[in-house]
Interface confidence: medium
């Protein structure tokens, strides 16, 4: 239904707190360099304006679109060109081109310092002084570093953050209460960020149809008792919500997500028996809970998939009558039977089925042609299953850090031209798949591993797009989203690469490494490992292990030495010589 004033409508629907949070996220995601104070001022102005429109929908400018109102605010910021360069050119355009222009200037890898957590006492003091400002800072800092973060979900994480601080700041030992809890929230939020970025990439590169197919597969796995029409209704609504968030329409997105959660809770009988616990929660927790609700129990009497999609004499007729609906029912039927498959795999199977029908339905004897299609799925299913087994075995043998190093070597060999920081970030993220997925029950491993890897590789592609340097990476990133992971897995050593010159300074370390937190130490060591592989792409695993063990021993010795500086300056060059010899 149309509203006289869009901004008043959203303010009324969302309430002041969520409205302000979402506007702050929107501004922070568009203009990533502005300070919190600059954005907070704009948010207050927009909120005050929204209140005037609530009081009188006919007041001046209240009938303007949200894009127009927000865009005008952003374009009125002083020194826009000095701070943002060509992004300022967006302000010469009219809506909707202006918003499109802002979207194109979102930076997936902004040059901002890492978000450092203050120590517990200081954090609790500022939280107690002004909880609203404290949470505003959190939203701003996360949103500007993750310009596609799913906004209503970020409000949920801020709420979690708030609850943790409220609880832990009342404890005697604030530090030991806060650290594990906030680390948990941070880890979940980072995974949420890469997953959402993948959804926006799917929408941006391949359109709504591709995202809707993803949603149909995912929802069919989770709600196998819902009928096809119910699944596609949910998929249609979910597509709209994600399209809005990916497009920067955060108020609409959050409002529609709340509506979808309401619909699901009012229609549990036709969706799933597992929703009640989620539906008892308040809004943000409810929507979050529904997004990761456990799979419903599969119906016991499902007929074999072959009955309708291979053996039925009218397969080609049904396909010709309404291709999208027929393929949609195939994806639905296959997915509801396979909660143990990844969404990426299900979409590959649907694509294979479609290609088979396209080919076979044009032949003289279609049934003879498509009769073997399910058998042809076998290699497509075996490939990711083998990937999971191999990688989880390796993770169990090496642990997370060792597993990350194995992946780092593998990926540096596949794409040695990629910058070392990007390779290290990717390997560390890819390596976390072990901790995240390999400890799960067998039937949950494949969906966890492959869908997580796909999201991480999407980030690799986004970073590579900015400065393309590897033909291998370009090739894998140019194809469809669901083929990316198999493409990367299939890459071998890049034979075209000319090894890097050996530079002693790359492997020269100083005593300041000793005081770094464990994570930073690991990154330093992994940076050195990637550089070694770039110097000797064909070094054996044994050679690299020798060098890395020697390196670890060197750090351990010098960090324990009485005179650390002297140790580093005398032993360092010896280490470099030994490394060169070991790799010769």
């Amino acid at each position: 239904e149309a509203h006289k004033s869009e901004i008043a409508h959203r303010y009324n629907d969302l309430g002041e707190q969520h409205f302000k949070g979402l506007v702050l996220i929107a501004f922070s995601q568009y203009l990533q360099k502005c300070s919190y104070d600059e954005h907070a001022k704009l948010v207050q102005e927009v909120t005050d304006f929204a209140k005037t429109c609530v009081a009188d929908e006919s007041a001046a400018n209240c009938d303007k679109s949200l894009h127009t109102l927000f865009g005008d605010k952003l374009c009125a910021i002083p020194n826009l060109r000095e701070n943002y360069g060509e992004l300022a050119d967006c302000c010469t355009k009219q809506e909707p081109e202006r918003n499109e222009c802002f979207l194109q200037h979102k930076d997936d890898n902004p040059s901002l310092p890492p978000f450092e957590r203050p120590e517990a006492e200081a954090m609790c003091t500022s939280f107690k002084e002004n909880p609203t400002t404290f949470m505003g800072h959190y939203l701003h800092e996360v949103a500007r570093r993750h310009p596609y973060f799913y906004a209503p979900e970020l409000l949920y994480y801020a709420e979690q953050y708030n609850e943790i601080l409220t609880q832990c700041c009342a404890e005697a030992d604030k530090e030991s209460c806060l650290t594990p809890k906030l680390d948990g929230v941070k880890e979940k939020a980072l995974v949420s960020s890469v997953r959402q970025r993948m959804k926006c990439s799917s929408m941006q590169k391949f359109g709504e149809r591709a995202f809707k197919a993803w949603a149909v597969a995912r929802l069919s796995q989770t709600f196998p008792n819902a009928d096809f029409a119910e699944i596609t209704k949910l998929a249609t609504d979910l597509t709209k919500v994600n399209k809005e968030c990916c497009h920067g329409d955060l108020l609409e997105c959050a409002d529609d997500r709340a509506e979808l959660a309401k619909y699901m809770c009012e229609n549990q009988a036709t969706i799933s028996s597992k929703l009640q616990t989620c539906c008892d929660k308040p809004l943000l927790k409810k929507a979050h809970c529904l997004s990761e609700v456990e799979h419903d129990t599969m119906p016991a009497d499902l007929p074999a998939i072959a009955a309708d999609f291979v053996e039925d004499q009218e397969v080609c007729k049904n396909y010709a009558e309404a291709k999208d609906v027929f393929l949609g029912t195939f994806l639905y039927e296959y997915s509801r039977r396979h909660p143990d498959y990844s969404v990426s795999l299900l979409l590959r199977l649907a694509k294979k089925y479609e290609a088979t029908l396209e080919k076979c339905c044009a032949e003289a004897n279609p049934p003879a042609c498509y009769g073997t299609v399910l058998a042809e799925f076998q290699p497509l299913v075996e490939e990711p299953k083998n990937l999971v087994k191999t990688n989880c075995d390796l993770y169990e043998k090496l642990g997370e850090y060792g597993f990350q190093n194995a992946i780092l070597v593998r990926y540096t060999q596949k794409a040695p031209q990629v910058s070392t920081p990007t390779l290290v970030e990717a390997a560390r993220n890819l390596g976390r798949v072990g901790t995240k997925c390999c400890t799960l029950p067998e039937d949950q491993r494949l969906p966890c591993v492959e869908d997580y890897l796909s999201a991480i590789l999407n980030r690799v592609c986004l970073l590579h797009e900015k400065t393309p340097v590897s033909e291998h990476v370009t090739k894998c990133c140019s194809g469809s989203l669901v083929e990316r992971r198999p493409c990367f897995s299939a890459l071998t050593v890049d034979e075209t690469y000319v090894p890097k010159e050996f530079k002693a300074e790359t492997f020269t370390f100083h005593s300041d490494i000793c005081t770094l937190p464990e994570k930073e130490k690991q990154i330093k060591k992994q940076t050195a490992l990637a550089e070694l592989v770039k110097h000797k792409p064909k070094a054996t695993a044994e050679q690299l292990k020798t060098v890395m063990d020697d390196f670890a021993q060197f750090l351990d010795t010098c960090c324990k030495a009485a005179d650390k500086d002297t140790c580093f300056s005398t032993e360092g060059p010896n280490l470099v010589t030994r490394c060169k010899d070991a790799l010769a």
Epitope: N225, A226, D227, F228, A229, E230, T232, K233, T236, Y263, N267, A269, T270, P299, L302, P303, D308, N318, V325, F326, T329, E333
Partner: nanobody, 119 residues
Framework: EVQLLESGGGLVQPGGSLRLSCAAS????????MLWVRQAPGKGLEWVSV????????YYADSVKGRFTISRDNSKNTLYLQMNSLRAEDTAVYYC????????????WGQGTLVTVSS
């Protein structure tokens, strides 16, 4: 007992319009997706259109897309099919059916209403 009663069929000239209705009883209509199917003389059953319990989304066979509109009134337990720009090949017995939990098939259907498109 599930009952579905179609009405509104008849003889119409090519290019003309008809509106079919289907009165439902014996099940919870407002939680059931519904569809229209048709059977042309000497042919097999062909599904025409599906509608979700809430009224959206809707789906159409390619052959009727842009000409037919499915709708429902849950307060009256009634399903509708508005048919415009009718063609000779739309001649068939039209059945309304309750959409099942599985496959593009159907669980229950009525006795049908005949639509004849002829000049």
């Amino acid at each position: 007992e599930v009952q579905l009663l179609e009405s509104g069929g008849g003889l119409v000239q090519p290019g003309g319009s008809l509106r079919l209705s289907c009165a439902a009883s014996g099940f919870t209509f407002d939680t059931s997706s519904m569809l229209w199917v048709r059977q042309a003389p000497g042919k097999g059953l062909e599904w025409v259109s599906v509608i979700h319990q809430s009224g959206t989304p809707t789906y159409y066979a390619d052959s009727v897309k842009g000409r037919f509109t499915i709708s429902r009134d849950n307060s009256k337990n009634t399903l509708y099919l508005q048919m415009n720009s009718l063609r000779a090949e739309d001649t068939a017995v039209y059945y309304c059916a309750k959409f099942p939990s599985s496959r593009m098939k159907f669980d229950y259907w009525g006795q049908g209403t005949l639509v004849t498109v002829s000049s």
